[in-house]
Amino acid sequence: LQDPCSNCPAGTFCDNNRNQICSPCPPNSFSSAGGQRTCDICRQCKGVFRTRKECSSTSNAECDCTPGFHCLGAGCSMCEQDCKQGQELTKKGCKDCCFGTFNDQKRGICRPWTNCSLDGKSVLVNGTKERDVVCGPSPADLSPGASSVTPPAPAREPGHSPQ
């Protein structure tokens, strides 16, 4: 015999008190699959947690974090404090990145600058606490006579024709 509850779709529950007919989930509850004997209570996004998606009869609410915090854990179960760019969160709070490292986000750890020389390149732009170094052409590409860049034409003053 087929279980009569298997006919109950998502958004309903199989109500044992009413001869196993499918009843809609009560307010602030949901069932995301069919054949459920109960509906689950909707998550409430309170305090540091903000509602990203409202609860519906077939899906739970989803939360994110208020500005100054970011989500951690499955389904944003926690909100971790942001730091500034150029910092990382340590056991003693937000600390500046050490020389030679950077963090371009408000979360995560400081990472070492790229070592341009490992790719045979030179440093075009120095790194900072907030930004990685920018690697340029290899030093060999910069030697005299090896340039493939066309030099700009010399500027002319208006009203003068070239000699």
Partner: nanobody
């Protein structure tokens, strides 16, 4: 070991004020967010307020906004809840609780240490 000890509860008339304290020990207090949670007679636990580790971010249950103020003194390892304009429905045991990870605010299910609670009764 972690210890949280609440004090300051008592009997107060509607419209009155109380200040709860929670003395913390056994962990680096200044690195953890803290909360107040309450349980009214015959009811479940209700989150009241959170404060982040440094004290600059505070959050409140809608029913207490504008009446309750959470604060902390990291030098004294103490959490506070100033309760003004108290109502009969604020009658409850008030618990302070510690969040599980440094510099992180969790949901109530994840708090890892709780105090023993202090009873607040609002009645004539």
């Amino acid at each position: 070991q972690v210890q949280l000890v609440e004090s300051g509860g008592g009997l107060v008339q509607p419209g009155g004020s109380l200040r709860l304290s929670c003395s913390a020990s056994g962990f680096t207090f200044s690195s953890y967010a803290m909360s107040w949670v309450r349980q009214a007679p015959g009811k479940g636990l209700e989150w009241v307020s959170d404060i982040n580790s440094g004290g600059e971010s505070t959050f409140y249950e809608d029913s207490v906004k504008g009446r309750f103020t959470i604060s902390r003194d990291n030098a004294k390892n103490t959490l506070y809840l100033q309760m003004n304009s108290l109502r009969a429905e604020d009658t409850a045991v008030y618990y302070c609780a510690k969040h599980p990870l440094t510099y992180t605010i969790a949901t109530m299910n994840d708090y890892d240490y709780w105090g023993q609670g202090t009873l607040v009764t609002v009645s004539f």
